[in-house]
C-alpha cells in the first residue's frame, strides 16, 4: 500500500494514526471519528490542550495514546464524550497536574503518565492512592515529580478531600412546617458546592441559599412523603468529592389497611401500616388480645427504602374453624391511633349441629349405602369430640 | 445448608443455672421462630418454649415460665435457653428447632445437660 | 393444655408389616405432626399438616385424621424404619408431644 501523506492515518477497521511532526494543534474534525475505537497521536508539539470539544463525536473510543508532544492541560471533563475509554496513555509529555475529575467515570484499566514533569501537590493524591492500591497499571511506572522525587514518597497528611457537616432540626416536624437545613464545609482548596434533591420530587418547596462554606437549604410546606428520602450534600476540591446524606423525620398520624385473608402457604390476613414513628401493632381477634406464637404471627415484608408504609401479613399456620372470626389491627404512634377489621373464615366448623341429631351429610354419588338425596346417619365414623383448645 | 450448632455438654450442680446457645447459619435467623424441646432420658419430648427473634417474642410452657429463659442475638444469629434453680430432674438432652410456616422443620444435635451434687 | 396419647407406646414388627401408630387429642386439633428419632439422634421432621411428607421421607409412610384421631401408616415395613415416633399438635399453647412410640423389630 502507498504511504499515506496525511496528518492522521486509518489503522486496522476502526484505528488512526496522527504521527506527522507537528500536523496537530487540536482534535476537532478528525477523519470517521464517530467509529474509532483507537486513536494513536505523536510527535504533536502544538498539541497543548485537550479539552471536551476535542473529543466530543468519539463515542467508541476505547484507547487513546497521546505520546511525545505538547500536552500541558487536559481539561477535567476532557472524556466526558468517551464513556468507553480503557486505555489512557499520555507519557511523554509536559503535564505537570491532572484533576481526578478527568478519570472519575471511567474504567481506566491503564493510566500511562511516565515522562511528565508532574509536580507534587494535593491535587495528585488520587494518583498517588492508584499506586498504592495498584490500580491502572500505575505502580509499573515508577513516577516522578519534577525535582521533587517520587510520587510514592509526596506527603499527604493534609491531602483530604472536603468535611462536611449538615446540621438538621432535632426537634419533631409535622406535616406543613418549613424546615431550615445548612451543611456547613471544612476543608483545603474548596471548588465546588451544591445540594442533590432528586428523591424529593413533590415532596417539599425547594430553597437554595448561601454559598461556601455554608449552604443553606429551606425544605417548605414538607408531605409525609419527605420522610425516607435522602437530602445530600456535595463538595468537591483538587483531592476530591465528599458527599453527605441526611433524612428529615417528618411527624404523622398511624394509619392501617387489612385485606382478605389468601391462602399462600398457609394463610395470611395482609396488612398495610404507616405511620413517622413507626407505630406500635396489636391485634385482637374477636374484640381479645391476640396472643401471637410460632402458628399466628405478625410477618412483615421488606420495606422499600424510600418509604414509610410496612407492608405484612397477620400469618396463620394451621387455622381452623376455632380461627375463624373478626380481626382487628391497631396500629398506634405518638400522634394518632387508627383500626381495621376483617372477617375471615377460614374452615367451616364441623360442629354446627345438635349433637343429638344425625350427623347432616351431603349426597354423593359414590356413597352406595343411600340411594336418595337425604341425609344418611353414618355410625361406623368415629364420633366427632366438641371441645376445642384455645391457646 | 440450614445448620443448628449447639453448645457442648454441661455438668452442673442443683440450683445452678445453665445456658445452652444454638447457632444458625444456611438461613435468615430473624424469620424463623426458635424452639426448645428437651428430653429426659429415656423419656418423651417436652416443649420448653419459642422466641421470634424478628420482634423478640417469647412463649413458654407454663411449667418452665418462672425458671427458663429465652434470649437471642441477632448479630451472631444465635439463640440462648438459660434454666436457673436446676434439680437432678432437669438432667435431659436439649434441642433447640426452628419453624416458619411449617413445625420444627430443623433441629440441632442436642446439648446434654446433668444435673448432679 | 392439649394431651397427646399415642398408641401403641411400643410395638414388635416385622419387615414387610404394615404399621399403624394413633394419636388421640384430649381436645380437637387442626393437625398432626410426626417425627422420628433414632437414638442418640435428634428428631426428625416426618409428616407435617397431618399428612404431607417431610422431604426425603419414602412413599410407603402416610398420615390422615382429623379432629382429635390421628394415625400414621407405614405400608412396608423396612430395616432403617425402627425408630421411636412422636406426634405433635402445633394448634395451641403450651405445644404438646406424645409420648411415643418405640418401633422394634420381633
Known amino acids: 500500500a502507498a504511504p499515506c501523506p496525511d496528518a492522521c492515518c486509518p489503522h486496522g477497521s476502526s484505528g488512526l494514526r496522527c504521527t506527522r511532526d507537528g500536523a496537530l494543534d487540536s482534535l476537532h474534525h478528525l477523519p470517521g471519528a464517530e467509529n474509532l475505537t483507537e486513536l494513536y497521536i505523536e510527535n504533536q508539539q502544538h498539541l497543548q490542550h485537550l479539552e471536551l470539544r476535542d473529543l466530543r463525536g468519539l463515542g467508541e473510543l476505547r484507547n487513546l495514546t497521546i505520546v511525545k508532544s505538547g500536552l500541558r492541560f487536559v481539561a477535567p471533563d476532557a472524556f466526558h464524550f468517551t464513556p468507553r475509554l480503557s486505555r489512557l496513555n499520555l507519557s511523554f509529555n509536559a503535564l505537570e497536574s491532572l484533576s481526578w475529575k478527568t478519570v472519575q467515570g471511567l474504567s481506566l484499566q491503564e493510566l500511562v503518565l511516565s515522562g511528565n514533569p508532574l509536580h507534587c501537590s494535593c491535587a495528585l493524591r488520587w494518583l498517588q492512592r492508584w499506586e498504592e492500591e495498584g490500580l491502572g497499571g500505575v505502580p509499573e511506572q515508577k513516577l516522578q515529580c519534577h525535582g521533587q522525587g517520587p510520587l510514592a514518597h509526596m506527603p499527604n497528611a493534609s491531602c483530604g478531600v472536603p468535611t462536611l457537616k449538615v446540621q438538621v432540626p432535632n426537634a419533631s416536624v409535622d406535616v406543613g412546617d418549613d424546615v431550615l437545613l445548612r451543611c456547613q464545609v471544612e476543608g483545603r482548596g474548596l471548588e465546588q458546592a451544591g445540594w442533590i434533591l432528586t428523591e424529593l420530587e413533590q415532596s417539599a418547596t425547594v430553597m437554595k441559599s448561601g454559598g461556601l462554606p455554608s449552604l443553606g437549604l429551606t425544605l417548605a410546606n414538607v408531605t409525609s412523603d419527605l420522610n425516607r428520602k435522602n437530602v445530600t450534600c456535595w463538595a468537591e476540591n483538587d483531592v476530591g468529592r465528599a458527599e453527605v446524606s441526611v433524612q428529615v423525620n417528618v411527624s404523622f398520624p398511624a394509619s392501617v389497611q387489612l385485606h382478605t385473608a389468601v391462602e399462600m402457604h398457609h394463610w395470611c390476613i395482609p396488612f398495610s401500616v404507616d405511620g413517622q414513628p413507626a407505630p406500635s401493632l396489636r391485634w385482637l381477634f374477636n374484640g381479645s388480645v391476640l396472643n401471637e406464637t410460632s402458628f399466628i404471627f405478625t410477618e412483615f415484608l421488606e420495606p422499600a427504602a424510600n418509604e414509610t408504609v410496612r407492608h405484612g401479613c397477620l400469618r396463620l399456620n394451621q387455622p381452623t374453624h376455632v380461627n375463624n372470626g373478626n380481626y382487628t389491627l391497631l396500629a398506634a404512634n405518638p400522634f394518632g391511633q387508627a383500626s381495621a377489621s376483617i372477617m375471615a373464615a377460614f374452615m367451616d366448623n364441623p360442629f354446627e349441629f345438635n349433637p343429638e341429631d344425625p350427623i347432616p351429610v351431603s349426597f354423593s354419588p359414590v356413597d352406595t349405602n343411600s340411594t336418595s338425596g337425604d341425609p344418611v346417619e353414618k355410625k361406623d365414623e368415629t364420633p366427632f369430640g366438641v371441645s376445642v383448645a384455645v391457646g | 445448608q440450614v445448620q443448628l450448632v449447639q453448645s457442648g455438654a454441661e455438668v452442673k450442680k442443683p440450683g445452678s443455672s445453665v445456658k445452652v446457645s444454638c447457632k444458625s447459619s444456611g438461613y435468615t435467623f430473624t424469620n424463623y421462630w426458635m424452639h426448645w424441646v428437651r428430653q429426659a432420658p429415656g423419656q418423651g419430648l417436652e416443649w420448653i418454649g419459642e422466641i421470634y427473634p424478628n420482634n423478640g417474642r417469647v412463649n413458654y410452657n407454663e411449667k418452665f415460665k418462672n425458671r427458663a429463659t429465652l434470649t437471642v442475638d441477632i448479630s451472631t444469629s444465635t439463640a440462648y435457653m438459660e434454666l436457673s434453680s436446676l434439680r437432678s430432674e432437669d438432667t435431659a438432652v436439649y434441642y433447640c428447632a426452628r419453624s416458619r410456616y411449617d413445625p420444627m422443620e430443623d433441629w440441632g444435635q442436642g446439648t446434654t445437660v446433668t444435673v448432679s451434687s | 393444655q392439649v394431651q397427646l396419647t399415642q398408641s401403641p407406646s411400643s410395638l414388635s414388627a416385622s419387615v414387610g408389616d404394615r404399621v399403624t401408630i394413633t394419636c388421640s387429642a384430649s381436645?380437637?386439633?387442626?393437625?398432626m405432626h410426626w417425627y422420628q428419632q433414632k437414638p442418640g439422634k435428634a428428631p426428625k421432621r416426618w409428616i407435617y399438616d397431618t399428612s404431607k411428607l417431610a422431604s426425603g421421607v419414602p412413599s410407603r409412610f402416610s398420615g390422615s385424621g382429623s379432629g382429635t384421631d390421628y394415625t400414621l401408616t407405614i405400608s412396608s415395613l423396612q430395616p432403617e424404619d425402627f425408630a421411636t415416633y412422636f406426634c405433635?399438635?402445633?394448634?395451641?399453647?403450651?405445644?404438646?408431644f406424645g409420648q411415643g412410640t418405640r418401633l422394634e423389630i420381633k
Open positions: 381436645s380437637s386439633v387442626g393437625y
Open positions: 405433635q399438635q402445633w394448634s395451641s399453647i403450651p405445644l404438646t
